[in-house]
Interface confidence: medium
């Protein structure tokens, strides 16, 4: 449905204040580092001139399309070479060239400080002076420093952040009121940020096909009892969402999840009985909700897949005349019967029948070749069965911050030459999954692990993909988006890798550790461990948990000593000569 | 990774003052420690001054001691040498350099180094 004037399209559409928030998310997320105060000022200029077209459609520039009109107004920018060097080349470029350049210019890991939160009555304050900034604010930081938050759901996070701050700033105690809630907020942030950020990389790096292949195989899972075609046109619609979003098209994107929403709950019946509560919703909760939702319960008569699938004379028939439709019914058939799998394992028990279909179809007797395929996908199967058994088991005996410590091990003892706050950062991360998956049942474990550890490792992926120094890291993470973990766990201690010189200082500790949060001392002594593992690969777990032990124990020592400063250089000494001699160094 | 990059440098009369600037990116300074160092014409690379990552523990080369400051602002991931009172054997090429969380007394303890600027003390 072609319209004269596509900025009045979604203005309308949208209404002004989700578009108001969707350009400003959209500026924010492709020149991260510009101030505030300069893209509130390009929002309104941009909602000023989408109200002249809405009243008029065929006024000046009113036909131009959306990359062309935000890409104008971002290259007016008048610091954008100093501030931004080459991307400022974009500037030259015709659409759909520069916007493709602007998206290549994202930032995963832009130079931005640290979000430091105010005391709870200076943000009641300001959220009271001014609501509207406040809450401005809020989007414009959170975008850039997430380039590819899923802007809809971002809107979603803005309105929770704003009914927190509209309840608890009138209660009696407000920190007990609010600071739970930012605390909730900004976890969940950040994992939605993860989540989309494998989206897109899946969209980008992988392609639609890979994307599709995804979507069939979760909301198969999602919405058993829906036929084949429904779950098509959903992928499909929701092929279209993320596609826009990873693309920077906001708008477009917002408006079509809105309308993606809309269809699912209009279709309720053909596609889920878990879907009541949410189609009750207003729009952002609703579509929050249908993204989270529970899958249904699995048709109770459904027949062996082995049937259509291998034990028919037609296999090779059907394959032929359309593979990707033949491939996505098999992804369909075994994901809908399997909600204990995580996405990944469907994918590649999809990715090994279709490698043996390609094989046996060109064979003498294919029927005798491929009759065993489903054979193949036993130790598929058991590998992440095994590996989650026994990695549950490890985190029930050491707890979250050790767990987290066996990992941050295993991993620089893989990729040694990743640097020292990333390695920490995302062992931290995969060390999180005991506490998220270990406290389900079996049939939920796997697919909260494994799709858990897909993010995380993409959010590795990423990082290192900007300043790239380990080949296993850059071979794992291209090869194939579904095998990443398995690469990953199958990596061995690095032999190629030159242990880092012994530097005494990196093991010595002030007095200031002693004020710092748990979650900052523990980063301080990870970071310290991951820097003795790059010293000493070879070193036993033995003794980097004797080590460990002592260096924890030191800590609380000089903690509690009335003279701090010299507890820790005194004792600071002894102990990093004992670990010396623990470890040989 | 961390990529460094140093600016501020120039001309500067004996007696006068300038202000070096180590600003990263590619990565957070928060869990680094950052340390200024200086190359003249013929001679040793030589540590002039380090910063821990807390901001905490700060120490000199005798011969800035009481002339040359450093600082850190986490928040803009940058960290500044202030100089003043500058002499000619001041001259050199300065460099930062990050290490993990604590200040190195080698050269060779530090991981990432910056590509230089030229300070010059002339009259």
């Known amino acids: 449905d072609a319209h004269k004037s596509e900025v009045a399209h979604r203005f309308k559409d949208l209404g002004e204040e989700n578009f108001k928030a969707l350009v400003l998310i959209a500026f924010a997320q492709y020149l991260q580092q510009c101030p505030f105060e300069d893209h509130v000022k390009l929002v309104n200029e941009v909602t000023e001139f989408a109200k002249t077209c809405v009243a008029d459609e065929s006024a000046e520039n009113c036909d131009k399309s959306l990359h062309t009109l935000f890409g104008d107004k971002l290259c007016t920018v008048a610091t954008l070479r100093e501030t931004y060097g080459e991307m400022a080349d974009c500037c030259a470029k015709q659409e759909p060239e520069r916007n493709e350049c602007f998206l290549q210019h994202k930032d995963d890991n832009p130079n931005l400080p640290r979000l430091v939160r105010p005391e709870v009555d200076v943000m009641c304050t300001a959220f009271h002076d001014n609501e509207e900034t406040f809450l401005k604010k809020y989007l414009y930081e959170i975008a850039r420093r997430h380039p590819y938050f899923y802007a809809p759901e971002l809107l979603f996070f803005a309105k929770r952040y704003k009914a927190a701050f509209t309840e608890c700033c009138q209660a009696a105690d407000k920190a007990a009121c609010l600071l739970p809630k930012l605390d909730e907020l900004r976890d969940e942030g950040k994992a939605s940020s993860a989540k989309q950020r494998l989206k897109c990389a899946s969209l980008q790096k992988f392609g639609e096909r890979a994307f599709k292949a995804w979507a069939v195989a979760r909301l198969s899972q999602r919405f058993p009892k829906a036929e084949f075609a429904e779950v098509s046109k959903l992928v499909t619609d929701l092929t279209k969402v993320h596609t826009e979003c990873c693309h920077g098209d906001l708008l477009e994107c917002a408006d079509d999840r809105a309308d993606l929403a809309k269809y699912i709950c209009e279709n309720q019946d053909s596609i889920s009985s878990k879907l009541k509560e949410c189609c009750e919703k207003p729009l952002l909760e609703k579509s929050h909700c249908i993204a989270e939702v529970e899958n249904d319960e699995m048709p109770a008569d459904l027949p062996s897949l082995a049937a259509d699938f291998v034990e028919s004379k037609d296999v090779c028939k059907n394959y032929a005349e359309a593979k990707d439709v033949f491939l996505g019914m098999f992804l369909y058939e075994y994901a809908r019967r399997h909600p204990d799998y995580s996405v990944v394992l469907l994918l590649r028990l999809a990715k090994t029948y279709e490698t043996t279909l390609e094989k046996c179809c060109a064979a003498a007797d294919p029927h005798e070749c491929y009759a065993k395929v489903f054979d193949e996908f036993k130790p598929l199967v058991e590998e992440p069965q095994n590996l989650i058994k026994q990695n549950c088991e490890l985190f029930e005996q050491l707890g979250e911050y050790k767990f987290q410590n066996a990992l941050l091990v295993r991993y620089t003892k893989k990729v040694p030459q990743v640097s020292t706050p990333t390695l920490v950062e995302v062992s931290r991360n995969l060390g999180k999954v005991g506490s998220k998956c270990c406290k389900h049942p079996e049939a939920k474990r796997m697919p909260c692990a494994e799709d858990y550890l897909s993010v995380v490792l993409n959010q590795l992926c990423v990082l290192h993909e900007k300043t790239p120094v380990s080949d296993r890291v850059t071979k794992c993470c291209t090869e194939s988006l579904v095998n990443r973990r398995p690469c990953f766990s199958a990596l061995e201690v690095d032999e190629t890798y030159v242990p880092k010189e012994f530097n005494a200082e990196t093991f010595t500790f002030h007095a200031d550790i002693c004020t710092l949060s748990e979650k900052e001392r523990q980063i301080k002594k990870q970071t310290a461990l991951v820097e003795l593992v790059k010293h000493k690969p070879k070193a036993t777990k033995e003794q980097l948990k004797a080590v460990m032990d002592d260096f924890a124990a030191f800590v609380e020592k000089c903690c509690k000593a009335d003279d701090k400063e010299t507890c820790f250089a005194e004792e600071g000494k002894k102990l990093v000569a004992a670990s010396q001699a623990a470890l040989g160094l | 990774e961390v990529q460094l990059l140093e600016s501020g440098g120039g001309l500067v009369q004996p007696g006068g003052s300038l202000r070096l600037s180590c600003a990263a990116s590619?990565?957070?300074?928060?869990?680094?420690?950052i340390g200024w160092f200086r190359q003249a014409p013929g001679k040793e690379r030589e540590g002039v001054s380090c910063?821990?990552?807390?901001?905490?523990?700060?120490n000199y080369a005798d011969s800035v001691k009481g002339r040359f400051t450093i600082s850190r602002d986490n928040s803009k991931n940058t960290v500044y040498l202030q100089m003043n009172s500058l002499k000619p054997e001041d001259t050199a090429v300065y460099y930062c350099?990050?290490?993990?969380?604590?200040?190195?007394?080698?050269?060779?303890?530090?991981?990432?180094w910056g590509q230089g600027t030229q300070v010059t003390v002339s009259s």
């Open positions: 910063i821990a990552s807390s901001g905490g523990s700060t």
């Open positions: 350099a990050a290490a993990v969380l604590e200040c190195r007394t080698v050269v060779r303890g530090y991981d990432y």
């Open positions: 590619g990565e957070t300074l928060d869990y680094y420690a």
